[in-house]
């Protein structure tokens, strides 16, 4: 089951997943000047069996013009605010090659991918929070959030983290205390702030299916 909304926003903090549960989707997007190949997928999917998980439907980009555009484009600040994503950073070797059962590691970069990644999480996914540079973490409890299903609705637990404006940078909790959580060890040092903005589906008491929230008309 996909999580209906985004993980909670904490002032002056970002979040990331150390591993992605099977069923997680990642938007296939290309940087400016490139597009998905015609037969390519809209999404990559974390899929697998009892012993191995991997990303299915690899994303592929091709030049959208005759002349290749190789300049890396940084999203405008207002775009970054809307998407709630950060730029991709150079991935390092995963700390632990053996993934959690039922989880995928951070997908490797694909050629000419967009500067940010947007994930669609599933129930049971855990994300970890850290304060942005220039802010220090005050922990009141776990600096993590889990997508849970309650009474047929999905919700994210509230991370117990406050970021204060002192010139120190905190670590991800998993990097401080690897034993704190089964997902505590980072699969990759790729820092991807991930999100899935979503519609709030309107439901009717009498209806068994979700009601349509789209209207179509002539221009």
């Amino acid at each position: 089951e996909l999580c209906d909304d985004d993980p909670p926003e904490i002032p002056h903090a970002t979040f990331k997943a150390m591993a992605y549960k099977e069923g997680t989707m990642l938007n296939c997007e290309c940087k400016r000047g490139f597009r998905r190949i015609k037969s390519g997928s809209l999404y990559m999917l974390c899929t697998g069996n009892s012993s191995h998980s991997s990303w299915d439907n690899q994303c592929q980009c091709t030049s959208s013009a005759t002349r290749n555009t190789t300049k890396q484009v940084t999203p405008q600040p207002e775009e970054q605010k809307e998407r709630k994503t950060t730029e991709m950073q150079s991935p390092m070797q995963p700390v632990d090659q053996a993934s959690l059962p039922g989880h995928c590691r951070e997908p490797p970069p694909w050629e000419n991918e967009a500067t940010e990644r947007i994930y669609h999480f599933v129930v049971g996914q855990m994300v970890y929070y850290q304060c942005v540079q220039g802010y220090r973490a005050l922990h009141r409890g776990p600096a993590e959030s889990v997508c849970k299903m309650t009474h047929g609705k999905t919700r994210w637990t509230q991370p117990q983290l406050i970021c204060t404006g002192e010139m120190e940078t905190s670590q991800f909790p998993g990097e401080e205390k690897p034993q704190a959580s089964p997902e505590g060890r980072p699969e990759s040092e790729t820092s991807c702030l991930v999100t899935t903005t979503d519609f709030q589906i309107q439901t009717e008491m009498a209806a068994t299916m979700e009601t349509s929230i789209f209207t179509t008309e002539y221009q």
Epitope: M25, E29, S39, Y43, L45, T47, I118, T197, F199
Partner: antibody, heavy 105, light 107 residues
Framework: PGSSVKVSCKAS????????ISWVRQAPGQGLEWMGG????????NYAQKFQGRVTITADKSTSTAYMELSSLRSEDTAVYYC???????????WGQGTTVTVSS | DVWMTQSPSFLSASVGDRVTITCRAS??????LVWYKQKPGKAPDLLIY???TLQSGVPSRFSGSGSGTDFTLTISSLQPEDFATYYC?????????FGPGTKVEIK
């Protein structure tokens, strides 16, 4: 025949999604036909080969609206055109009510 | 392109009957299969995704199975509101093709 039509699809009840919006058409008495899709947050579209060059799918994040423009219309384009939120592996879970386009001389 | 076929095209059944509709893909699509139900004059409704996972709010009398190229939609006990046309769709690769549909009519 020969003209163009632009159908709009407005999302309400929430923010414009980072999921895809797909366009599907259905000719009278016929089945469903996927035309193409777009992820509004990025604005890049994919099209079925059958419609390549004739269809343009766009999205306006500021108005939470997706558009499908079909050009060089012919009588066989007479159909109901639907937009839907497309979650890929998880299917198209929310659909518009459909817009009937009739091409006649 | 991946081509989808459905059988039967038409099906006459009575309330309470067990109904099975099959869908076949021209090439392997793993479990990237979705089922929809459509009533005349209405937009389709999502029934099942990932070949066998019931969409939220869909009655448990509906079930899906299969993987690779052969898939099945089963209605364990047909209800009056189930008389409709059912479509399968592969979401494995572009274009996301639909099956031609199976119309379930009242006997």
């Amino acid at each position: 025949p020969g003209s163009s039509v632009k159908v709009s699809c407005k999302a309400s009840g929430g923010t414009f999604s980072s999921y895809a919006i797909s366009w599907v058409r259905q000719a009278p008495g016929q089945g469903l036909e996927w035309m193409g899709g777009i992820i509004p947050i990025f604005g890049t579209a994919n099209y079925a080969q059958k419609f390549q060059g004739r269809v343009t799918i766009t999205a306006d994040k500021s108005t939470s609206t997706a558009y499908m423009e079909l050009s060089s219309l012919r009588s066989e384009d007479t159909a109901v055109y639907y937009c839907a939120r497309d979650k890929g592996y998880y299917g198209m879970d929310v659909w518009g009510q459909g817009t009937t386009v009739t091409v006649s001389s | 392109d991946v081509w989808m076929t459905q059988s039967p095209s038409f099906l006459s059944a009575s309330v309470g009957d067990r109904v099975t509709i099959t869908c076949r893909a021209s090439q392997g699509i793993n479990s990237y299969l979705v089922w929809y139900k459509q009533k005349p004059g209405k937009a389709p409704d999502l029934l099942i995704y990932a070949a066998s996972t019931l969409q939220s709010g869909v009655p448990s009398r509906f079930s899906g199975s299969g993987s690779g190229t052969d898939f099945t939609l089963t209605i364990s006990s047909l209800q009056p509101e189930d008389f409709a046309t059912y479509y399968c769709q592969q979401v494995h690769s572009f274009p996301f093709t639909f099956g031609p549909g199976t119309k379930v009519e009242i006997k």
